[in-house]
């Protein structure tokens, strides 16, 4: 058993039929010695008396808020949560496996630039009685500071018969140099509590590997005389690291109709303009990627050909 | 300890081409190592990230773009003295700071070159003959060093009398390649910045 936060404890249980469970001793936080009784949740049934209560925790029915009282007055609470371990593996029931970039990916993180600021998000089908707490650091032994905000519900989607909820959190490395060469990864730890179930999820990464620039901005078209070709120009996104001559991007320019199966014109360039063939009912799209370290491409920025 | 904006005369900065080739060569070599050594811990997640130049050179700090010198987190610089003449310095206006930067890059390349050559000598003794260093990568390191053209004491190639542990050597190769790729990215960024300045 360990303390998650003040008066909230996590009991780690091997989860299999007829498992013996864990013996837990609760102590009432009071100078009083006599006349103390214990109850669980809203029940008025007295579970025991005395300054300590010993319980055998085997299942979710044994978890919950234990309260010690004296003469109708509440003295203190202890909330017990369960963390299940099945076949030596901690349960991952609360969050959905995003399966990208690989199986067992519960947390996904992205950074728009090298400033040390990044966003992580996760998915769940649970809509109520759900809380998250996020911690982060650079490295695990001798960790350096990363400050994370509160996790918030950022999107809701309908997937078949199910609703899916996306939560996200923003974090900022306390003293980040955009030009630094990372040797210790960022560690992100998410504590998830659903009703009386506790789970924790972790992700470890270098900022350089989670870079995904914003799309290029200010796309403009200039038809070329006596030609089907157009010159398309754009600018670096505002959120990209500066100076741009040091943090350079490369671009992919594509002309395509509405369907992905349609024919297309595609060209890669390090410049902020390109010449392509425009077709009726097609769109010109441009996306960006770090020129020197191939992490993710940005989303497309698009303008219609006509 | 940073790069000033007013640097070389217009025209192709001589080392940019070589630094692009360097990044390409080390990336290819790393990819080859990951594929060939698939049953060894050779991915970014599996290896320890070591920097053989740590406390010996200070490339990131010495080559910091002017715009980042206002960022206090970028200025925990280690003072290191370097030789200050080189053919990539395309004009007399080139500052002492830039010479320091290019000299630091030269020292990095020299250190990695020695490590890679020592390692290759060991890998050539491996009866499995599983992996060797790409000669193209070694040649590209050499070309960039020649383009930088700094005079510096020759670092003797390390020779070891004991029987090499080939498993450890291959793990070390992965660690070295990962670190060198990251440094090659920095070098490419620096050369691109200088070329634009």
């Amino acid at each position: 058993i360990w303390e998650l936060k003040k008066d909230v404890y996590v009991v780690e249980l091997d989860w299999y039929p007829d498992a013996p469970g864990e013996m837990v001793v609760l102590t009432c936080d009071t100078p009083e010695e006599d006349g103390i009784t214990w109850t669980l949740d809203q029940s008025s049934e007295v579970l025991g008396s005395g300054k300590t209560l010993t319980i055998q925790v085997k299942e979710f029915g044994d978890a919950g808020q234990y309260t010690c009282h004296k003469g109708g007055e509440v003295l203190s609470h202890s909330l017990l949560l369960l963390h299940k371990k099945e076949d030596g593996i901690w349960s991952t029931d609360i969050l959905k496996d995003q399966k990208e970039p690989k199986n067992k990916t519960f947390l996904r993180c992205e950074a728009k630039n090298y400033s040390g600021r990044f966003t992580c998000w996760w998915l769940t089908t649970i809509s109520t009685d759900l809380t998250f707490s996020v911690k982060s650091s650079r490295g695990s032994s001798d960790p350096q500071g990363v400050t994370c905000g509160a996790a918030t519900l950022s999107a809701e989607r309908v997937r078949g018969d199910n609703k899916e909820y996306e939560y996200s959190v923003e974090c900022q490395e306390d003293s980040a140099c955009p030009a630094a060469e990372e040797s210790l990864p960022i560690e992100v730890m998410v504590d998830a509590v659903h009703k009386l179930k506790y789970e924790n999820y972790t992700s470890s990464f270098f900022i350089r590997d989670i870079i995904k620039p914003d799309p290029p901005k200010n796309l403009q078209l200039k038809p070329l005389k006596n030609s089907r070709q157009v010159e398309v120009s754009w600018e670096y996104p505002d959120t990209w690291s500066t100076p741009h001559s040091y943090f350079s991007l490369t671009f992919c320019v594509q002309v395509q109709g509405k369907s992905k199966r349609e024919k297309k014109d595609r060209v890669f360039t390090d410049k902020t303009s390109a010449t392509v063939i425009c077709r009726k009912n097609a769109s010109i799209s441009v996306r960006a990627q770090d020129r020197y370290y191939s992490s993710s491409w940005s989303e497309w920025a698009s303008v219609p050909c006509s | 300890r940073n790069l000033p904006v007013a640097t070389p005369d217009p025209g192709m900065f001589p080392c940019l081409h070589h630094s692009q080739n360097l990044l390409r060569a080390v990336s290819n070599m790393l990819q080859k190592a990951r594929q060939t050594l698939e049953f060894y811990p050779c991915t970014s997640e599996e290896i320890d990230h070591e920097d053989i130049t740590k406390d010996k050179t200070s490339t990131v700090e010495a080559c910091l773009p002017l715009e980042l010198t206002k960022n206090e987190s970028c200025l925990n610089s280690r003072e290191t003295s370097f030789i200050t003449n080189g053919s990539c310095l395309a004009s007399r206006k080139t500052s002492f700071m830039m010479a320091l930067c290019l000299s630091s890059i030269y020292e990095d390349l020299k250190m990695y070159q020695v490590e890679f050559k020592t390692m290759n000598a060991k890998l050539l003794m491996d009866p499995k003959r599983q992996i060797f260093l790409d000669q193209n990568m070694l040649a590209v390191i050499d070309e960039l060093m020649q383009a930088l053209n700094f005079n510096s004491e020759t670092v003797p190639q390390k020779s070891s009398l004991e029987e090499p542990d080939f498993y450890k050597t291959k793990i070390k190769l992965c660690i070295l390649l990962h670190a060198f790729r990251i440094r090659a990215v920095t070098i490419d960024r620096v050369m691109s910045y200088l070329n634009a300045s």
Epitope: Q229, R261, E262, K263, K264, D265, R266, V267, F268, D270 | -
Partner: antibody, heavy 118, light 107 residues
């Protein structure tokens, strides 16, 4: 199986014209760009131009501009390349090629030898 | 027009050995570079698109690398069927242009 079947070899006199055909099978004809590329004996490959069969748009290499015409007939899934004012240096194997991507070729025909000789 | 220069023009290789062909562009073309294989009397066949993207059905022994002006096609272990002429082609701008070709011959 996507295939491009080209017309047979031709022998032409200098100053005349030649029209080579290329019939596509497998996939929808108008879903692809069609190009013509030639190869003179013992020489490398030389791009001549492309057509979008969907709308008839064409683009030609400056070297052939005014001498080459590329057309397409959607009803028969056939593209044509006509080269006029033939000279001996136009002796070459002419290939048609196609792709959903405009700027390179994933399927190439078997070639048509055009010999220009007096 | 962008001029593509291949080297060497002839490459004698022992079967089973690796082979590398170089292609250089007269100006920077990013990764807009494609490789083809042509056997005598046959049409060319696409091997690699956009400098390093492998093409379905092409053996994994063929790989490409490079960007900007310098590109390489590598065949990790030459098989008897790989003896052919190899062409690079740039797609950075029209007109599309090819290298002169590199003939890989049996040593």
């Amino acid at each position: 199986q996507v295939q491009l079947v080209q017309s047979g070899a031709e022998v032409k006199k200098p100053g005349s014209s030649v029209k080579v055909s290329c019939k596509a099978s497998g996939g929808t004809f108008s879903d692809y760009y069609l190009h013509w590329v030639r190869q003179a004996p013992g020489q490398g490959l030389e791009w001549m131009g492309w057509i979008d069969p969907e709308n008839g748009d064409t683009e030609y290499a400056p070297k052939f501009q005014g001498r080459v015409t590329i057309t397409a007939d959607e009803s028969t899934s056939t593209a044509y390349m006509e080269l006029s004012s033939l000279r001996s240096e136009d002796t070459a194997v002419y290939y048609c090629a196609r792709n959903k991507e405009l700027r390179y070729f994933d399927v190439i025909g078997q070639g048509t030898l055009v010999t220009v000789s007096s | 027009d962008i001029v593509m220069t291949q080297s060497p023009l002839s490459l004698p290789v022992t079967p089973g050995e690796p082979a590398s062909i170089s292609c250089r562009a007269s100006q920077s073309i990013s990764i807009n570079l494609h490789w083809y294989q042509q056997k005598p009397g046959q049409a060319a066949r696409l091997l690699i698109a956009f400098a390093s993207q492998s093409i379905s059905g092409v053996p994994s022994r063929f790989s490409g690398s490079g960007s900007g002006t310098d590109f390489t096609l590598t065949i990790s272990s030459l098989q008897p069927e790989d003896f052919a002429t190899y062409y690079c082609q740039q797609s950075n701008s029209f007109p599309l242009t090819f290298g002169q070709g590199t003939k890989v011959e049996i040593k």
